[in-house]
């Protein structure tokens, strides 16, 4: 039970975190006009992965895609790869650990088989939140190398840009959004690694021991975790693991009041 | 047609204060920042501040500050301005000018003269 | 606060000619964001209230006559009027509509010569 919640929470919590990743990338909110000096401003800019922002005093916003690829910061498209393939990780995690799912019954998929891929998606998320942490801190890193620079902005020479009075830009909403993600996407895989021992014996310690319960014999095999029999015998069977015993629910297609949380 | 009507003519004492209104149709009244511009007789024109219809939110130049209050009534599509604590060089026209792209002023009322006798 | 300086105060010009009237702000009006010049351009005549011509320095009001363009950049900017026709008598004005508090310059006085 305990390895199911364990996983499920780690699924949960990997799911806001990927969400919470994509909303980041797709924010425009990365770093913000610094409005130390001035808290009022009638004219206010911020700037995204993919664009940037101009919103007045008048209420209206105007937004410009940075159309040029060539042209753009190195630093700035290296971001947007690690968020790019830490979203399409973390989706695949996604698609994988629903598979995984000891709550959810797939044909006769085993429980080595749900192991695995509860690993697999783990290790995908914690690269994926890792992914999220690195390109989010690398933006933060050329805000704050380019916040007393009196060059422009920080995307001076995009687009052929005039030379101007620096408009100097903090961090943004988006960047915390991201470092927040990023952070529950890392624990919620840390979480799925954890459910993963928890469902898959230890092959070496594992013991061949057979049962008998009445009319019918029930025995486990080495490597194998389903009851020889294709009977649903209410028979709790005990699987042993470094020498210390649990009792778990007998492996059947039918379900029981512990398949789903 | 966009229109911005204020308010008539007003005569007041020193030290009283006076709410100009200036009620906008023809256009959504919470979807454009209302300006408020001072002109005083054979002078040029100067800005008082601002205020956004749809939150509430204001902007005051430093001058005005603590004497003037820029409030709406969004059910009645109407913006006011009081100016508070009234001094003879207070006379002047006051116009309500809506805010377009560019923070441009694109639509005026007529304008609303406050006499303030020294 | 941007200081607006207008010249000259007043101009007086013939009916055909072209007028040109020149504005300066103590800080620069470009915004780096969207590269545009936050700076307006009204036109008033005598008992009434003021009109939009210009806004973010060159771009032309909707109904406004073409002969009126606007020029320039960062500080230094220039209103035209390439044929002077008799309506266009008035006091002309700019404004800093960047940075709060937005302020106006004094006025250029057009007159017919």
């Known amino acids: 039970m305990a390895v199911t919640a364990c996983q499920g929470l780690g699924f949960v919590v990997s799911l806001i975190g990927i969400a919470g990743i994509i909303a980041a990338t797709c924010m425009d909110q990365w770093s913000t006009q610094d409005l130390y000096n001035n808290p009022v401003t009638a004219v206010f800019n911020y700037q995204g992965l993919w664009r940037s922002c101009v919103r007045e005093s008048s209420g209206f916003t105007e937004c410009r895609g940075y159309f040029t690829l060539l042209g753009l910061p190195a630093m700035l498209q290296a971001v947007r790869a690690l968020m790019i393939v830490g979203i399409v990780l973390g989706a695949i995690g996604l698609l994988v650990s629903i598979f995984a799912l000891k709550c959810i019954r797939i044909g006769s998929m085993e429980d080595s088989a749900k192991a695995n891929m509860t690993l697999t998606s783990g290790i995908m998320f914690i690269v994926s939140g890792l992914c999220a942490i690195a390109g989010v801190s690398v933006f933060a890193n050329m805000l704050v190398t380019n916040f007393w620079m009196s060059t422009a902005n920080m995307y001076t020479g995009m687009g052929g840009m005039v030379q101007t009075v620096q408009t100097r830009y903090t961090f943004g909403a988006a960047l915390f959004v991201g470092w927040v993600a990023g952070g529950l996407t890392l624990i919620g895989g840390v979480m799925m690694c954890i459910a993963c021992r928890g469902l898959a014996p230890e092959e070496t310690n594992y013991k061949a021991v057979s049962y008998h319960a009445s009319g019918h014999s029930v025995a486990y095999k080495p490597g194998g975790f389903k009851a020889s029999t294709g009977f649903g015998s209410n028979t709790k069977n005990k699987k042993i693991y470094d020498g210390g015993a649990r009792t778990e629910d007998e492996v059947q297609s039918y379900p029981s009041k512990h398949d789903y949380v | 047609e966009v229109q911005l009507q204020q308010s008539g003519a007003e005569v007041k004492k020193p030290g009283a204060s006076v709410k100009v209104s200036c009620k906008a149709s023809?256009?959504?009244?919470?979807?454009?920042?209302m300006n408020w511009v001072k002109q005083a007789p054979g002078q040029g024109l100067e800005w008082i501040g601002l205020i956004n219809p749809y939150n509430g939110g204001t902007s005051y130049a430093q001058k005005f500050q603590g004497r003037v209050t820029m409030t709406r009534d969004t059910s009645i599509s109407t913006a006011y301005m009081e100016l508070s604590r009234l001094r003879s060089d207070d006379t002047a026209v006051y116009y309500c000018a809506r805010m377009n792209y560019g923070n441009a002023m694109d639509y005026w009322g007529a304008g609303t003269t406050v006499t303030v006798p020294s | 606060d941007i200081v607006m300086t207008q010249s000259p105060d007043s101009l007086a010009v013939s009916l055909g000619e072209r007028a040109t009237i020149n504005c300066k702000s103590s800080?620069?009006?470009?915004?780096?964001?969207?590269?545009?010049?936050?700076l307006t351009w009204y036109q008033q005549k005598p008992g009434q209230p003021p009109k939009l011509l210009i806004y973010w320095a060159s771009t032309r009001e909707s109904g406004v006559p073409d002969r009126f363009s606007g020029s320039g950049s960062g500080t230094d900017f220039t209103l035209t009027i390439s044929s002077l026709q008799a309506e266009d008598v008035a006091v002309y004005y700019c404004q800093n509509d960047y940075s709060y508090p937005l302020t106006f310059g004094a006025g250029t006085k057009l007159e017919l010569k």
């Open positions: 023809g256009y959504s009244f919470t979807g454009y920042t």
């Open positions: 800080q620069s009006l470009l915004n780096s964001g969207n590269q545009k010049n936050y």
